[in-house]
């Protein structure tokens, strides 16, 4: 049968000092979040069947302004990457938020099962929990 | 048969006042835009088969230069969201133009037949009407 | 059979001077690229099956600051279009970098067996060739 | 900490009925794949059936196919196997497993069935 | 119906090197059957070694290790210890299905 394998995430929280992860929640309790095939495991997005999937994500950062974004020396900056296994470790999609509150980007990319998506916020603003402005999701197109 | 719901649409022109609402268009005589499946009810977007979707939108900002989105105190703000039934109401991805002109982005999102989306734009600037700077789509995924 | 055409595309190089067209490559050789069904014909994007594609690019500037890109009194700006067959030559998507470092978005449209797509990108400033930050992709999503 | 916990094991009849719940804490079931697995007295490991994230894919094992319904209760944070028609070779040791790699076992609940 | 095979016995001396195999009875195993291994000391519930043809799983000790060698799915162990000693069973999914199909289990005696 297709795969069709699907996901949709709103933000749960980040993650203690020293851990750049975004951690995600989803479920129909939880507004318009799914997973449909893919797996969260201690918040953080594993994928379940092998293929080329579109990658999408949101962050918007909370208590920002151009002004906040644009102070520090060291822009805020997300990225997408497979994390685990260690084998298979690299970045996917990575932004910088340049006086702008917001990234949103998407791109097409080979996953195998088994493979761990993080979404790693670097900088000292932390992301919005509104469900309209922080979301990651993944949506497997082909074999 | 295979939903394959899916429609872009270009901007057609803003409400009057007090109307938030960016008001679309679609077909082939129009150039690039078309509805396959989806309806337009007085400019507004409805959905006419239960699904998940893809919703992308991209609005660039006329007249525009980065002093003049941060010179407002309020800064211009795009929200889709479903505005009827309303019932159903809810917003379903917002996105501010700091310093910036142009804002893009997609989510995956459940949608119901009879759903209508809307596309608020708040703020004093006015959207480009270009069909290569403003748009609006949904694309069915699965059921 | 299901079209199922599907490309992501790695920075190769820019032009040479007068020619603002950025050049593509793909391959699993090179890393997460890929072409399965569309061309590449000197770096250009070539379509090989009629239907309506979902297209997506990010383009992230290299050696970039906010200020970079405010400097300018012509803002960087990244165009998507048709550029061959001249016929049907059409700008699809176009997006300024107003203080930003990176543009990212999609869209769908229509394309034919037979359409180049180019990417243009004008100003100064030399895109990121970061396989994370530059990116341009086709998913074929229906007839 | 981490732990799926089996229960609703039991001595039945042929014919009769169970109802097994595997009780999940210090994770939420529905973000997994979840398994049932059986191991008859002195014989190896039987695969018996999955339920994916969305609880829209089931998949069982031919010899309990049109028998055994798996489900979760969301409300409880728990994996449930209804047996319905049950016969003398579903007598086993029924373990609840978490994840697609099969991750985390539970301790397994006995089911007996005898007259 | 095709059947995973394990052998039903193997032994090892202590500090030995021993390779489990698991095969289909038609076809080739390969890593989309993403072959899984199990341990199952007497009494005890199974736990997972391997995952994904090699991936171990966490607070497994790194003499397990899983590989596709010819047409089947192997374990091996290297400088096996007596707690060793176990029955070990493998596990394949059918390739698309979501399906499973455990093998017979192969019981490994540790010498001495």
């Known amino acids: 049968s297709l795969g069709w394998d699907i996901a949709e995430l709103q933000l749960n929280h980040t993650g203690p000092q020293q851990d750049p992860r975004l951690y995600w929640q989803g479920g129909p309790a939880l507004g318009r979040s799914f997973l449909r095939g893919p797996e969260l495991d201690k918040g953080q997005l594993r994928i379940r069947r092998d293929g080329i999937y579109m990658v999408h994500i949101q962050v918007t950062l909370a208590i920002c302004s151009s002004t906040s974004t644009s102070r520090h020396h060291h822009p805020t900056t997300l990225a997408v990457g497979i994390c685990s296994p260690a084998s298979r470790s690299i970045s996917l999609l990575r932004l910088s938020f340049h006086q702008g509150c917001t990234i949103a980007s998407q791109r097409l990319t080979p996953l195998a099962r088994g493979d761990t998506l993080c979404t790693n916020l670097t900088g000292t603003l932390l992301p919005s929990r509104n469900t309209d402005e922080t979301f990651f999701g993944v949506q497997w197109v082909r074999p | 048969s295979l939903g394959w719901d899916i429609a872009e649409l270009q901007l057609n022109h803003t409400g009057p006042q007090q109307d938030p609402r960016l008001y679309w268009q679609g077909g082939p005589a129009l150039g690039r835009s078309f509805l396959r499946g989806p309806e337009l009810d007085k400019g507004q977007l409805r959905i006419r088969r239960d699904g998940i979707y893809m919703v992308h939108i991209q609005v660039t900002l006329a007249i525009c230069s980065s002093t003049s989105t941060s010179r407002h105190h309020h800064p211009t703000t795009l929200a889709v969201g479903i505005c009827s039934p309303a019932s159903r109401s809810i917003s379903l991805l917002r996105l501010s133009f700091h310093q910036g002109c142009t804002i893009a982005s997609q989510r995956l999102t459940p949608l119901a037949r009879g759903d209508t989306l809307c596309t608020n734009l708040t703020g004093t600037l006015l959207p480009s009407r270009n069909t290569d700077e403003t748009f609006f789509g949904v694309q069915w995924v699965r059921p | 059979s299901l079209g199922w055409d599907i490309a992501e595309l790695q920075l190769n190089h820019t032009g040479p001077q007068q020619d603002p067209r950025l050049y593509w490559q793909g391959g699993p050789a090179l890393g997460r690229s890929f072409l399965r069904g569309p061309e590449l014909d000197k770096g250009q994007l070539r379509i090989r099956r009629d239907g309506i594609y979902m297209v997506h690019i990010q383009v992230t500037l290299a050696i970039c600051s906010s200020t970079s890109t405010s400097r300018h009194h012509h803002p960087t700006t990244l165009a998507v279009g048709i550029c061959s067959p001249a016929s049907r030559s059409i700008s699809l998507l176009r997006l300024s970098f107003h203080q930003g470092c990176t543009i990212a978005s999609q869209r769908l449209t229509p394309l034919a067996r037979g359409d180049t797509l180019c990417t243009n990108l004008t100003g100064t400033l030399l895109p990121s060739r970061n396989t994370d930050e530059t990116f341009f992709g086709v998913q074929w999503v229906r007839p | 900490e981490l732990q799926v916990v089996e229960s609703g094991g039991g001595l039945v009849q042929p014919g009769g009925s169970l109802r097994l719940s595997c009780a999940a804490s210090g994770f939420t079931l529905s973000n997994y794949w979840m398994h049932w697995v059986r191991q008859a007295p002195r014989k190896g490991l039987e695969w018996v059936s999955t339920?994916?994230?969305?609880?829209?894919?089931?998949y069982y094992a031919d010899s309990v196919k049109g028998r055994f319904t798996i489900s979760r209760d969301h409300a409880k944070n728990t994996l449930i196997l209804q047996m319905n028609s049950l016969k003398s070779e579903d007598t086993a040791v029924y373990y609840c497993i978490r994840g697609s790699d099969y991750e985390h076992w539970g301790q397994g609940t006995q089911v007996t069935v005898s007259s | 119906q095709t059947v995973v095979t394990q052998e039903p016995s193997l032994s090892v001396s202590p500090g030995g090197t021993v390779t489990l195999t698991c095969g289909l009875s038609?076809?080739?195993?390969?890593?989309?059957?993403?072959p899984g291994w199990f341990q199952q000391t007497p009494g005890q519930a199974p736990r997972t070694l391997i995952y994904?043809?090699?991936s171990r799983h966490s607070g497994v000790p790194s003499r397990f290790s899983g590989s596709i060698s010819g047409n089947k799915a192997a374990l091996t162990i290297t400088g096996a210890q007596p707690e060793d000693e176990a029955d070990y069973y493998c596990?394949?999914?059918?390739?698309?299905?979501?399906?499973?199909?455990f093998g017979g289990g192969t019981h490994l005696t540790v010498l001495g």
């Open positions: 339920i994916s994230t969305d609880n829209s894919r089931t």
């Open positions: 596990a394949l999914e059918e390739i698309g299905s979501y399906t499973y199909m």
């Open positions: 038609s076809g080739s195993v390969t890593t989309t059957n993403y």
């Open positions: 994904s043809t090699s």
